[in-house]
């Protein structure tokens, strides 16, 4: 029996004969911009842009069902036009057009905002683009804008605005010695400005021998006034002279003196925590310093909070190392020797691609990243020794590691 007439839209047919008898063959080629869809028994076999397919009449049926569907370019995205939103009322197939609008605060540059779906399934090259602009930068607290043009509302990506911190403020991260006050912010790709900030200049804390004896109006920040109340009323060294003022350059305008009534010496430090040793070559007078050290050579002297002992230091706690205590004018040791403990020091070879259990704590920078897959250089954690448990002492504990980015990090905030 003959096959029915072969009719394929958007295609050209080339048949072996005009008859549709058993064994007759036709080659189907889709027009440019259309894709061959080949089915057998209503099941899609393949979709191809390639040149043609041959169908054969077999027992009154064509052995394949063929259609030519328009190429689909799919909805355009930022790869076509950055910072734009697209509208495609005609769909996204061959020949159809989409228009785009620039998302605020980007602005259209050029006048043809249409894209056409091309025969190869790609969108036509845009003849316009969205130029991202930044609005006027927001005010930075305690800073003055130095660039006049930056008060306007249109700024190209990459352009800079210069600021200067007000007296008594400086750029964070710059040391008090360098006191950097000027900084620039840049208009970024997403139409926002890089953040800039000015933080108050601070003075160094007064010498530790005065610890606990002074009151300050605003900590050690610029303009703060710190005072020690003396009982003596000697005119040359009276009440007024034991006041110091933090200047805008980060230095004090003077220095404290020891009040006349502050005499004597600190008691001999005893009842030290285990392994701790104090050496006091200058005795125990006010201002005398005792060097702290640990009897075990590979331990370090550190300060722990009152209620924490060496045995129960959580891994996220990064205790402060301490190298000396000083006898204050209040005849107390600072820091108090009872708070000083000896903790096992870090082993060498942090960041060497071996996870050393002893270093897997904040105090040792989590072994330089060696215990987390996301931070170890080889991207594979190798415990050392091999018996170290990857769920136990050699587990990924670093709260900064990617492994913890979606977990509940309460309790890590101390570290």
């Amino acid at each position: 029996t003959d096959c029915p007439e072969l009719a394929v839209e958007n295609a050209s047919l080339n048949c072996s004969s005009s008859d549709r008898y058993h064994g007759a063959q036709c080659t189907v080629s889709c027009r440019t911009g259309y894709v061959l869809q080949i089915r057998r028994d209503d099941e899609l076999i393949k979709s191809q842009t390639g040149p043609s397919v041959t169908v054969t009449c077999t027992e009154g049926k064509w052995n394949k069902q063929v259609a030519c569907e328009p190429v689909d370019c799919s909805i355009p995205d930022h790869h076509q036009v950055y910072a734009a939103s697209f509208s495609c009322p005609e769909g996204t197939t061959f020949g159809s057009q989409c228009s785009f609008q620039c998302r605020h605060p980007a602005q259209l540059k050029g006048n043809n905002s249409l894209l056409t779906c091309m025969e190869d399934g790609l969108w036509s090259f845009p003849e316009a683009l969205c130029e991202l602009m930044c609005l006027a930068p927001p005010p930075v607290p305690n800073a003055d804008l130095q660039t006049a043009r930056c008060r306007e509302n249109k700024h190209k990506v990459g352009s800079f605005c210069k600021y200067k911190c007000k007296p008594g403020y400086h750029v964070p991260g710059s040391s008090r010695k360098s006191k950097k006050r000027a900084f620039k912010t840049q208009c970024t790709q997403d139409g926002s400005w890089q953040e800039g900030a000015c933080v108050p200049v601070t003075c160094d804390p007064p010498p530790p021998k005065f610890h606990g004896l002074y009151q300050c109006t605003n900590g050690f920040q610029f303009n703060s006034e710190c005072r020690i109340k003396c009982e003596d009323s000697d005119a040359s060294q009276g009440l007024g002279s034991n006041v110091i003022h933090c200047r805008k350059d980060g230095t004090w305008n003077g220095s404290f003196h020891v009040c006349q009534e502050m005499q004597g010496q600190c008691s001999v430090p005893n009842e030290l925590n285990s392994n701790l040793k104090l050496q006091c070559p200058d005795g125990y007078a006010i201002g005398s310093e005792c060097a702290t050290s640990c009897l075990d050579h590979n331990s370090e002297s550190i300060i722990l909070p009152m209620n924490v002992t060496v045995r129960d230091i959580p891994h996220w706690l990064n205790p402060t190392r301490v190298e000396r205590v000083v006898c204050t004018a209040g005849l107390k040791w600072y820091p108090h020797p009872a708070l000083i403990h000896c903790v096992k020091g870090c082993e060498p070879f942090m960041g060497d691609n071996y996870c050393d259990a002893i270093n897997n704590r904040a105090f040792c920078n989590y072994d330089g990243g060696d215990c987390c897959t996301s931070t170890v250089k080889t991207k594979k954690v190798t415990p050392f020794p091999m018996s170290c448990d990857l769920q136990g002492d050699c587990a990924c504990r670093d709260p900064q590691a990617q492994e913890h980015s979606r977990k509940d990090l309460r309790g890590y905030s101390h570290g």
Epitope: H297, G345, C346, E347, P348, M350, G351, D352, Y354, G368
Partner: antibody
């Protein structure tokens, strides 16, 4: 008194070999990692190699990897550096250093000069 | 590898001056930074470890500060015996690397 004393330096031709030794005294040698640091004439310090306390984990700078071998004999309180395939750029004073805790070189030897020249 | 950049490479100062040397790491090294002093013909000597801790026996005129990538060694009042070359060294990860050195000379 804590002391490190290097020996074994000298003049050697390019391609030649040399073995440096470092004798330790005044501390428990087996309780510390040890290291070699070198300094070319008129130049800065360059870390060369290190070895852990007892299990013998070894580390090398890329510039010497495959040519130098660090080792230790805890029974003799001695650190070694076997240097093969020596090059002119290996000319330097070689210091032996004790590694304390999370890596600081707290005790240094006086250094031994290695000159590689034809 | 972590690169360490010291500045300045040399400086001239007088006795009594306050001297500041900076060291910058190519990536964050937390506080794993040490400072050494070296005099001509001598071995280096450890001054400061973990960025700010003074090694035992080192005068308190030496101080260190910083964390992350930027570090500072300060000599509050330069003494005649302080004229030397100073090196920073990172111990955050192997290979351990030194800065190029800063030579402090007499003005």
């Amino acid at each position: 008194e804590v002391q490190l004393l290097e020996s074994g330096g000298g003049l050697v031709q390019p391609g030649g070999s040399l073995r440096l030794s470092c004798a330790a005294s005044g501390f428990t040698f087996s309780s510390y990692a040890m290291s070699w640091v070198r300094q070319a004439p008129g130049k800065g310090l360059e870390w060369v190699s290190a070895i852990s306390m007892t299990v013998g984990r070894t580390y090398y700078a890329d510039s010497v990897k495959g040519r130098f071998t660090i080792s230790r004999d805890n029974s003799k309180n001695t650190l070694y550096l076997q240097m093969n395939s020596l090059r002119a750029e290996d000319t330097a004073v070689y210091y032996c250093a004790r590694v304390w805790g999370g890596v600081r070189f707290d005790v240094w030897g006086q250094g031994t000069l290695v000159t590689v020249s034809s | 590898d972590i690169q360490m950049t010291q500045s300045p490479s040399s400086l001239s100062a007088s006795v009594g001056d306050r001297v500041t040397i900076t060291c910058r790491a190519s990536q964050s090294i937390s506080t794993y930074l040490n400072w050494y002093q070296q005099k001509p013909g001598k071995a280096p000597k450890l001054l400061i470890y973990v960025a700010s801790i003074l090694q035992s026996g080192v005068p308190s005129r030496f101080s260190g500060s910083g964390s992350g990538t930027d570090f500072t060694l300060t000599i509050s009042s330069l003494q005649p015996e302080d004229f030397a070359t100073y090196y920073c060294q990172q111990s955050s990860s192997t290979p351990w690397t030194f800065g190029g050195g800063t030579k402090v000379e007499i003005k």
